[in-house]
């Protein structure tokens, strides 16, 4: 028996997790905070000049397992970390750029230490 007021229609999963967002804020975000039913993330990647840029925000539950898996992309240096343990947990994440592969040394001296 259904409880009084309970609907049989499917309901959207509530957005329960709040995350810090930076360079990746939806239009409805307030004070650089977004809400999600999935994960918070922080990502670091290099732009075309070789400058490291950090972005952070919310990932929806759908597909976030794949997005949070830090699969290497050829010729692109990036790293992502995800969390769900508490609100704004991603402000404590600190992804770092992966080390350069030997083949990247052909890009010239600016691309390695």
């Amino acid at each position: 028996k259904k409880e009084d007021g309970e609907s049989t229609a499917p309901t959207a999963r509530p957005k329960v997790l709040r995350c810090k967002c930076h360079h990746h804020c939806p239009e409805d975000s307030v004070n650089n905070i977004c809400s999600t039913d999935g994960y918070c993330f922080t990502m670091i990647e290099e732009d075309d000049s070789g400058t490291p840029v950090v972005t952070s925000g919310c990932l929806g539950l759908e597909g976030s397992d794949f997005q949070c898996r830090d699969t290497p992309i050829p010729h692109q240096r990036r790293s992502i970390e995800c969390c769900t343990e508490r609100n704004e947990c991603n402000k404590d994440l600190h992804p770092t750029l992966p080390p350069l592969k030997d083949r990247d040394f052909v890009d010239g001296p600016i691309h390695h230490k």
Epitope: I44, D48, G50, T51, V54, S56, L93, I110, H111, K113
Partner: antibody, heavy 119, light 107 residues
Framework: QIQLVQSGPELKKPGETVKISCKAS????????MNWVKQAPGKGLKWMGW????????AYADDFKGRFAFSLETSASTAYLQINNFKNEDTATYFC????????????WGTGTTVTVSS | SFVMTQTPKFLLVSAGDRVTITCKAS??????VAWYQQKPGQSPKLLIY???NRYTGVPDRFTGSGYGTDFTFTISTVQAEDLAVYFC?????????FGSGTKLEIK
């Protein structure tokens, strides 16, 4: 020894263009990044961006996109900062600063160039 | 952009005193914080990089510590020539941002 020597002070009218030079000596220009940092009178330091001295690709902080341009003359071991359409708020001392590759602290700083707006 | 909140703004100390300056980052910076000294009329000079590494030629009275969001810079025994403004800087992500500075004055 390693030095970054910048061009002398400039007095500019609003709307004019200024080009500041930064000559590197004691090391090879193309093996380190070259950054530009602004210091307004009595104020703190603001990173403007940098130029990848190997590829020549510049990157600008958001506040310095548009009127500002970084360039290189590698044969002369010199980096340049050009400010177009000079404005009152551009009055400042500008520093070039070297960074090790893929490190973003600045281990050698230029002598500084003060650019002032003339009324 | 990431904010580096530096305190205090001013310090008035006597030669021989111990001085501590703090910087609080708005996000986890790991070890990616540097400290600079700028004497009056001069360019900044790098003192500390990666939070705790003393740059070449920097006297050992200058030390840095911290990780994540809280960083500390210490001068163990202040000398007259330490009169300067000190800045922290995060070098983790573009745009690389500086603290507002701490002006150290000697009594």
């Amino acid at each position: 020894q390693i030095q970054l020597v910048q061009s002398g002070p400039e007095l500019k009218k609003p709307g004019e263009t200024v080009k500041i030079s930064c000559k590197a000596s004691g090391y090879t220009l193309t093996t380190y990044g070259m950054n530009w940092v602004k210091q307004a009178p009595g104020k703190g330091l603001k990173w403007m961006g940098w130029i990848n001295t190997y590829s020549g690709v510049p990157a600008y902080a958001d506040d310095f996109k548009g009127r500002f341009a970084f360039s290189l003359e590698t044969s002369a071991s010199t980096a340049y900062l050009q400010i177009n359409n000079f404005k009152n708020e551009d009055t400042a001392t500008y520093f070039c600063a070297r960074s090790e590759l893929r490190n973003w602290y600045f281990d050698v700083w230029g002598t500084g160039t003060t650019v002032t707006v003339s009324s | 952009s990431f904010v580096m909140t530096q305190t205090p703004k001013f310090l008035l100390v006597s030669a021989g005193d111990r001085v501590t300056i703090t910087c609080k980052a708005s996000q986890n910076m790991g070890h990616n914080v540097a400290w600079y000294q700028q004497k009056p009329g001069q360019s900044p000079k790098l003192l500390i990089y990666y939070a705790s590494n003393r740059y070449t030629g920097v006297p050992d009275r200058f030390t840095g510590s911290g990780y994540g969001t809280d960083f500390t810079f210490t001068i163990s025994t202040v000398q007259a020539e330490d009169l300067a403004v000190y800045f922290c800087q995060q070098d983790y992500s573009s745009p690389f941002t500086f603290g507002s500075g701490t002006k150290l004055e000697i009594k």
